[in-house]
């Protein structure tokens, strides 16, 4: 029987009974937070062969092996992953081995096995036989291998039963437990699965099969399952569903997603039966099962019950995520916040139409309104007292409304009001009048020329770049020396730069008044010689990357109306030179005959330019005569140490430090100090662990149902 849509077993181990009739779990399986150690020996689910999403085990006391629970679990498809992982075993205090001796394939995703203080038999499993790429696996903080003394079946009797493979240059026996070998298919099967008797399965089988070369005898399907047969693609008039089976139109019409409203069920799109139209598509009518492309962002109408939606935090903005039409009024009042501009853009950046008015007041955290990056129409169906539909009052750091060169905004009805915005130049407001079609609507007091822009460099001159030079990780630029009316008023220059894959950035992108800024800033002092052009060397850049750069002059000069005069450049786009690419990833080689090797790899993570070709080199190696000869009968060779506590990176202090070759001199000395790169890597690793743990906790700790 198919079970799902995801099974969460927590608190009470007897809930495991829910798995009794499952052959396939269409979705995930969580077993977690069972704090009382129980006897799991009476629980066995031999029918379960496939999990279509992921398996997560977390804090299950008393469970020592998964082999008895799931003796026939063969495939974890990873159609949806838990933080990039298809198998997560985390903080399982009593788990001694994984023991999933029939697990043959994890189709997508990696594994994360962490902080399991008593867990052994990890180094004896060759994960490359189960996963395509092992580079993303994370196996950390478990019982140290040298404390485990893992023995594969028959090793003690010197009649080893398991096969050997090489991992990290170590050729060794592969097993799941002391009495279960890791199954390997004959090389003649290639990528195909095999039966218990080593006969090759049908190419459409995955994991295993009950009879050779028979597409109806598969334990799981490589591609799709339909009416008892494994098929490479779904037959006509059937549709892919949940990544593993084919269903007909009626089936798809008959199911609802947990998130959908009463009337909206699943849709059929691109040969798949799915919960919702994919990004960029919308249903062809409210009751339709089919998707059509959206023109521009897909419309989503959001309505505020109380007519006016107050945006005073990221949390309140979050409610508008994905909205394109907002029925009501927007009151924006952002006094403080972290990374506020990009957060607001994330949640409000798709709004195109506001049917009422927009009011921005006391929003001292805002530098620009560009976070409303798609706003094109304010209808003004409801207006503030005085017939205002756009009202901007007391925003101490607001410098830009929008980039009017790339913005069409219409205010259909109502007037604009601007007051007490000391960094907002009046010219910017007048430009908005022109663009929005409100010129002539405002009366004299609606745009205050005294208290708008009183503390800004509103009369800007243009700085011109004079030269640019690039290398793979450096840019040198120079610009004309700016000469304000009084030379003494020129203090310095500030250079702003950032990665810009596209030539569409503006000065205010990602900038807020609370310190967040997507631009890197460098101060450049004036050259002592008045005739030398100012310039800067930007270093530590990425190869073959386009950067946006602009320069501002920092001045003191006041001109008419006590407004500050300043200067800045246009935004310059400049690309660093190409460099050597990083190494290709996930290199795999396999032999498919006595005279051929098939080598596969993924592109480098940093191409550092346009890749034109790869060079593959190979050479014949002498047969490795070294065989594993450790005698487990002499137990004294296995260091006996304290029980592992499942923590990570605890360095043990020993009385006699190891002798290391350090800095070219032989002899006893301290361990070499860690390089900056190693320290950075450790820091990133610790950060990554924290992020994962937070994700885990946030995902699984939920309020009790009412």
């Amino acid at each position: 029987e198919i079970c799902g849509p995801g099974i969460d077993i927590r608190n009470d181990y007897q809930q495991l009974k829910r798995l009794e009739n499952c052959t396939v779990i269409e979705g995930y399986l969580h077993i977690l937070l069972i704090s009382k150690a129980e006897d799991y020996r009476s629980y066995r689910f031999p029918k379960l062969t496939v999990i279509t999403e992921y398996l997560l085990l977390f804090r299950v006391a008393g469970l020592e092996s998964l082999g008895d629970l799931f003796p026939n679990l063969t495939v974890i498809r990873g159609w949806k992953l838990f933080y990039n992982y298809a198998l997560v075993i985390f903080e399982m205090t009593n788990l001694k081995d994984i023991g999933l001796y029939n697990l043959r394939n994890i189709t997508r995703g990696a594994i994360r096995i962490e902080k399991n203080a008593d867990l052994c038999y990890l180094s004896t499993v060759d994960w490359s036989l189960i996963l395509d790429a092992v580079s993303n696996n994370y196996i950390v903080g478990n019982k140290p291998p040298k404390e485990c003394g893992d023995l594969c079946p028959g090793t003690m009797e010197e009649k080893p039963m398991c096969e050997k493979t090489t991992i990290n240059n170590e050729y060794n026996y592969r097993c799941w437990t002391t009495n279960r070998c890791q199954k390997m298919c004959p090389s003649t099967c290639g990528k195909r699965a095999c039966t218990e008797n080593n006969e090759c399965c049908h190419p459409e089988c995955l994991g295993s099969c009950s009879a050779p070369d028979n597409d109806t005898a598969c334990v799981a399907c490589r591609h799709y399952y339909y009416a008892g047969v494994c098929v490479p693609a779904c037959p006509p008039n059937t549709y892919r569903f949940e990544g593993w089976r084919c269903v007909d139109r009626d089936f798809c019409a008959n199911i609802l997603s947990a998130e959908s409203s009463d009337s909206e069920g699943f849709v059929i799109h691109d040969g798949e039966c799915m919960q919702e139209c994919p990004s960029g598509f919308i249903r062809n009518g409210s009751q339709s099962m089919y998707c059509i492309p959206c023109e521009g962002p897909c419309p989503k109408v959001c309505e505020e019950e109380k007519k006016t939606k107050t945006i005073d935090s990221v949390t309140s903005a979050q409610m508008l995520q994905g909205c394109t039409i907002f029925k009501g009024n927007l009151l924006i009042n952002i006094r403080r916040g972290n990374n506020i501009a990009s957060e607001l853009e994330n949640f409000m950046g798709l709004i195109e139409v506001v049917t009422g008015y927009v009011k921005i007041r006391h929003s001292h955290a805002l530098v620009s309104l560009s976070f409303l990056k798609n706003l094109r129409l304010i209808l003004g169906e409801e207006q503030l007292e005085g017939n205002y539909s756009f009202y901007v009052l007391d925003n101490q750091n607001l410098q830009q409304l929008w980039d009017w060169d790339h913005r069409n905004l219409t205010i259909k009805a109502g007037k604009m009001y601007f007051a007490f915005n000391p960094k907002l130049c009046v010219s910017e407001i007048y430009r908005m009048e022109e663009v929005t079609g409100t010129k002539g609507r405002q009366s004299k007091g609606d745009i205050n020329t005294r208290n708008n822009g009183e503390r800004a460099s509103c009369e800007s001159d243009v700085l011109h770049f004079t030269s640019t030079t690039t290398s793979k990780n450096r840019i040198i630029i120079t610009w004309h020396r700016y000469r304000p009316p009084d030379y003494r008023d020129l203090i310095s220059f500030t250079v702003y730069y950032k990665e810009a894959p596209f030539k569409n950035v503006t000065e205010y992108d990602g900038q807020d008044a609370c310190g967040s800024n997507s631009w890197n800033m460098v101060d450049v002092d004036l050259p002592p010689n008045k005739d030398v052009e100012p310039g800067i060397l930007l270093h530590g850049l990425k190869p073959w990357t386009q950067y946006a750069v602009y320069v501002k002059a920092v001045t003191l000069t006041m001109v008419e109306n006590d407004h500050i005069r300043g200067a800045k450049s246009e935004i310059l786009y400049i690309r660093t030179n190409a460099s050597v690419p990083s190494i290709p990833l996930d290199v795999l080689s396999a032999s498919n005959s006595s005279s051929q090797l098939i080598v596969k790899w993924n592109p480098p993570s940093l191409p550092n330019g346009n890749l034109s070709y790869y060079i593959v080199r190979w050479q014949r190696q002498p047969q490795d005569g070294y065989l594993y000869r450790h005698n487990y009968c002499s137990k004294d060779k296995i260091p006996i140490r304290k029980y592992a506590d499942g923590t990570i990176d605890i360095e043990e202090v020993t009385e006699n430090p190891k002798t290391e070759v350090c800095g070219g001199e032989k002899g006893p000395c301290c361990a070499c100090p860690k390089t900056e790169a190693e320290k950075q890597a450790e820091k990133e690793e610790a950060e990554y662990r924290k992020v994962f743990e937070n994700f885990l906790h946030n995902s699984i700790f939920v309020p009790r149902p009412e």
Epitope: E1, I2, A227, G228, V247, N254, I255, L256, S257
Partner: antibody, heavy 123, light 112 residues
Framework: EVQLQQSGPELVKPGASVRISCKAS????????MNWVKQSHGKSLEWVAN????????NYNQKFKDKATLTVDKSSNTAYMELRSLTSEDTAVYYC????????????????WGTGTTVTVSS | DVLMTQTPLSLPVSLGDHASISCRSS???????????LEWYLQKPGQSPKLLIY???NRFSGVPDRFSGSGSGTDFTLKISRVEAEDLGVYYC?????????FGGGTKLEIK
């Protein structure tokens, strides 16, 4: 075309048993429960029971627990209902109707009905 | 068992008239997940029943938009905005929320 073809009319004696069939075509048989519904002459409809073709799991209306037994034959995409210890009260038209087999959320309706089998119990 | 009570038993109408049929359940048929499995079926003389409305108010594909369903909790209504000759027959409400699933007694829509 999706169809549920039911077996022909049955005339049976009181106390006897009868097995009626419902052959599915045009869809994946194992994706839907098979339900059976009774309609006595001039009366309303009564849900009898349903069966999961994958594993033979059944749900019965307690009223029919001792009267009806449901089975399936996956190889021929056919569902069966056996009625035993028949009395005149069992004289009715019996319909099969499919209902999606999906553990998540479903619209849960009988979207396809069989043609109906008339069972007459008479001595 | 959940008893489904339909009123009226018979509904004589003229073609083009509006028609309304009521169905009341003896207890709430709202499931714990918030879904209400209330359907309406039409059975024409000598035919099998056919699905019209599912989950209170959703029209099944191919059902004309003159049919509409409404209600919540225990009270439900089927409305036909302009009755046509092909609409004549017996209408049944059905609850699929609690086992045993139950049908209403039926309402016969006939010409005056």
């Amino acid at each position: 075309e999706v169809q549920l073809q039911q077996s022909g009319p049955e005339l049976v004696k009181p106390g006897a048993s009868v097995r009626i069939s419902c052959k599915a075509s045009g869809y994946a048989f194992t994706d839907y429960y098979m339900n059976w519904v009774k309609q006595s002459h001039g009366k309303s409809l009564e849900w009898v029971a349903n069966i999961n073709p994958n594993n033979g799991g059944t749900n019965y209306n307690q009223k029919f627990k001792d009267k009806a037994t449901l089975t399936v034959d996956k190889s021929s995409n056919t569902a069966y209902m056996e009625l035993r210890s028949l009395t005149s009260e069992d004289t009715a038209v019996y319909y099969c109707a499919r209902w999606i087999l999906y553990y998540g959320r479903s619209k849960w309706y009988f979207d396809v009905w069989g043609t109906g089998t008339t069972v007459t119990v008479s001595s | 068992d959940v008893l489904m009570t339909q009123t009226p038993l018979s509904l004589p109408v003229s073609l083009g008239d509006h028609a309304s049929i009521s169905c009341r359940s003896s207890q709430s048929i709202v499931q714990s997940n918030g879904d209400t499995y209330l359907e309406w079926y039409l059975q024409k003389p000598g035919q099998s029943p056919k699905l019209l409305i599912y989950r209170i108010s959703n029209r099944f594909s191919g059902v004309p938009d003159r049919f509409s369903g409404s209600g919540s909790g225990t009270d439900f209504t089927l409305k036909i905005s302009r009755v046509e000759a092909e609409d004549l027959g017996v209408y049944y409400c059905f609850q699929g929320s609690h086992v045993p699933y139950t049908f209403g007694g039926g309402t016969k829509l006939e010409i005056k």
